[in-house]
Amino acid sequence: LQDLCSNCPAGTFCDNNRSQICSPCPPNSFSSAGGQRTCDICRQCKGVFKTRKECSSTSNAECDCISGYHCLGAECSMCEQDCKQGQELTKKGCKDCCFGTFNDQKRGICRPWTNCSLDGKSVLVNGTKERDVVCGPSPADLSPGASSATPPAPAREPGHSPQ
């Protein structure tokens, strides 16, 4: 009897009530592996969740978060508020990055600007709340009169622009 059940493919279950016949999974259920004795009930993406991928007879539904939130936890078990670039999420909501830090995404924390001088470089483009500084060659690398490029910004670490 066990051998009969092992022949049941994904999307079916081994129906004990029908002499181990492979029956299709009922609506709103699935089996992702063969030889299953039952089909699992599909996840429902409702309320704070929306459907990213519909349930099929062989795979569970996949959920996403409603607009303004992004998934957190295993298989999107909860949703975390989005922030704007240049902000980070605190327990009280979105908060602007402090001076000297930036965040270029809708999630995550503000990170310190790169310290160009640690690599012997100078600040080519100043940092903002949304963007890291861009480091350029060190002043010593620029041979006098070799280029007409704009001289590097004063080596104020970490660099910033008015906000």
Epitope: K46, G47, A74, S77, K92
Partner: antibody, heavy 124, light 107 residues
């Protein structure tokens, strides 16, 4: 402050229809993320989900009680109404309404706010 | 419907004890599980959602773990106010279903 409050008869007779009202405050029933459930608990027994309604009027019923339950909402009155037909003594229980789809930095779909419950006795 | 089975149904413990309650689901539900605490005559109170995330204001002595079909609620050091009944609830689909409860009593 978010609250839910159940109201309705304390005593109903067998075969009668029970009508319970859940009045909510501090949030809107029209909010797309919010759902409200009715849950009951017979004396000394476990919690049992009865029915759930979403802002778009989508409804999900207990499999075993589906034929006896109806649920509706009146967004303007901030009320969700449960009716249960053909009451019998084993329906004696505390009936709760609860909200899911919380607000804030992290949202989820567990029941974060519950009403205090209303005890309903079915007896002739 | 998805069935949830809690064990034990009753548990006697003393203040300061470490207490563990198990909830088994009849099918895999990833981490779509919540835990509630209920005291006599009161409505249930949400403790944990998404299997392991503490609800705001819940003491850190409460923790949840597990995924798939087996979940646990742990109270690291039982306090007098923790004597209550605890319920698990699946958040996989509607209608939500609950376990039969675990009553934590004073030894």
């Amino acid at each position: 402050q978010v609250t839910l409050k159940e109201s309705g008869p304390v005593l109903v007779k067998p075969t009668e229809t029970l009508t319970l009202t859940c009045t909510v405050s501090g949030f809107s029933l029209s909010n797309a993320r919010v759902g409200v459930s009715w849950i009951r608990q017979p004396p000394g027994k476990a919690l049992e989900s009865l029915v759930h309604i979403f802002s778009n009027d989508e409804k999900f019923f207990s499999t075993s009680l589906k034929s006896r339950l109806t649920i509706s909402k009146d967004t303007s009155k901030s009320q969700v109404v449960l009716t249960m037909t053909n009451m019998v003594p084993v329906d004696t229980a505390t009936y709760y309404c609860a909200r899911n789809g919380g607000f804030g930095v992290i949202i989820h779909d567990a029941f974060d706010i519950w009403g205090q419950g209303t005890m309903v006795t079915v007896s002739s | 419907d998805i069935q949830l089975t809690q064990s034990p149904s009753f548990l006697s413990a003393s203040v300061g004890d470490r207490v563990t309650i198990t909830c088994r689901a009849s099918q895999g539900i990833s981490s779509y599980l919540a835990w509630y605490q209920q005291k006599p005559g009161k409505a249930p109170k949400l403790l944990i959602f998404a299997a392991s995330t503490l609800q705001n204001g819940v003491p850190s002595r409460f923790s949840g773990s597990g995924s798939g079909t087996e979940f646990t609620l742990t109270i690291s050091s039982l306090q007098p106010e923790d004597f209550a009944t605890y319920y698990c609830q699946q958040l996989n689909n509607y209608p939500r279903t609950f376990g039969q409860g675990t009553k934590v009593e004073i030894k």
